[in-house]
Interface confidence: low
């Protein structure tokens, strides 16, 4: 089963700024990536960004910068100011659609005792759920 990994990191320079990285370990081509917070999109979560390989990228506050890192991974920077800013225990979810193979989703949050800037290195990325 293809797997999705999610990494959440608090930036050392801006304590209210988060970076979310997600990747798809399957072999199919990706048709759409949806990033949400507060739970999966459509299950109580709120969409932060949608990335389409051809049509481009759309993002909503407090998302500041969403981009493709590779053909199968994305990153998203969140601005942490105002009422809609994330907190340390916020859950972030990524859903990769790869038709007709199916769609896969994973969620993650900051490690419980993570110091800013000291979260797990990008390789190997933590696989949180193959779903």
């Amino acid at each position: 089963t293809p797997e999705v990994w999610v990494q959440v990191r608090m930036e050392a320079t801006e304590l209210s700024s988060f970076t979310i990285r997600c990747g798809f370990l399957g072999s199919g081509s990706i048709s759409l990536v949806t990033v949400s917070w507060g739970g999966p999109n459509g299950a109580g979560g709120t969409t932060l960004a949608v990335l389409h390989p051809e049509r481009g990228i759309r993002q909503w506050a407090p998302a500041r910068q969403a981009r493709w890192e590779t053909q199968s991974s994305i990153s998203l920077i969140l601005e942490g100011s105002g009422a809609s800013s994330p907190c340390a225990n916020t859950t972030f979810c990524c859903k990769f659609a790869s038709f007709p193979e199916g769609s896969w989703e994973a969620c993650g949050s900051l490690p419980p005792s993570s110091d800013p800037g000291l979260s797990a290195p990008p390789t190997p990325a933590p696989i949180l759920r193959a779903d």
Epitope: T1, P2, S31, L32, T34, P40, N41, G42, A43, T47, V50, H52, E54, R55, R58, A97, F99, P100, E101, G102, S103, W104, E105, R129, A130, D131
Partner: antibody, heavy 115, light 107 residues
Framework: EVQLVESGGGLVKPGGSLRLSCAAS????????ISWVRQAPGKGLEWVSE????????YYPDTVTGRFTISRDNAKNTLYLQMSSLRAEDTAVYYC????????WGQGTLVTVSS | DIQMTQSPSSLSASVGDRVTITCKAS??????VAWYQQKPGKAPKLLIY???YRFTGVPSRFSGSGSGTDFTLTISSLQPEDFATYYC?????????FGGGTKVEIK
């Protein structure tokens, strides 16, 4: 060959409950998100619920949230829809469908809610 | 929720005709639109996904186009087996939503 076979439909009184099943074969069931889609007599298609491949994530429209529960047993290659507090407007043919969008469909099972 | 408005709701055509069905989304869905064909008493069949990709086994006379909010299904030369009801659907976000359907009848 991909096959989806629904069962469990029938006549139920308003306020009653029913559990639908969808038996899958011909593909790796645990690798796919599966949905239920319904069609009231003479009407269009309405998506009712979706469950992710491992069963962790579930989705519902407002019309059935709190009344319907989707689940799956990947060991048995079977999808379920538990329906409670049924209303007359839930009368429809219920289809299970694989993928996102829906590449393969079952033949449907009729649910009639009437007193 | 994203509304999908399909038109016309029905049309009459002859074998060999070129038929066009349109679908308008209430907001931008990029290219995440699918088209289905349904015959009476049968389950729907996927024809087109992601706006323009034909699903396995779908004849080349079926094609899809559009992006953003406006989408089109075209049958280049209508065949007797094509008389059916057609639905568009957005697979951009949850809840998944369908158009109201277009019934293609024999003239």
């Amino acid at each position: 060959e991909v096959q989806l076979v629904e069962s469990g439909g029938g006549l139920v009184k308003p306020g009653g409950s029913l559990r639908l099943s969808c038996a899958a074969s011909g593909f790796t069931f645990s690798s796919y998100g599966i949905s239920w889609v319904r069609q009231a007599p003479g009407k269009g298609l309405e998506w009712v619920s979706e469950i992710s491949s491992g069963g962790t994530y579930t989705y519902y429209p407002d019309t059935v949230t709190g009344r319907f529960t989707i689940s799956r047993d990947n060991a048995k290659n079977t999808l379920y829809l538990q329906m409670s507090s049924l209303r007359a407007e839930d009368t429809a043919v219920y289809y299970c469908a694989r993928g996102d969008p829906f590449g393969y469909w079952g033949q449907g099972t009729l649910v009639t809610v009437s007193s | 929720d994203i509304q999908m408005t399909q038109s016309p709701s029905s049309l009459s055509a002859s074998v060999g005709d070129r038929v066009t069905i349109t679908c308008k989304a209430s907001q931008d869905v990029m290219t995440a639109v699918a088209w289905y064909q349904q015959k009476p008493g049968k389950a729907p069949k996927l024809l087109i996904y992601s706006t323009s990709y034909r699903f396995t086994g779908v004849p080349s006379r079926f094609s899809g186009s559009g992006s953003g909010t406006d989408f089109t299904l075209t049958i280049s030369s209508l065949q007797p087996e094509d008389f059916a009801t057609y639905y568009c659907q957005q697979h951009y976000s949850t809840p998944r939503t369908f158009g109201g359907g277009t019934k293609v009848e024999i003239k």
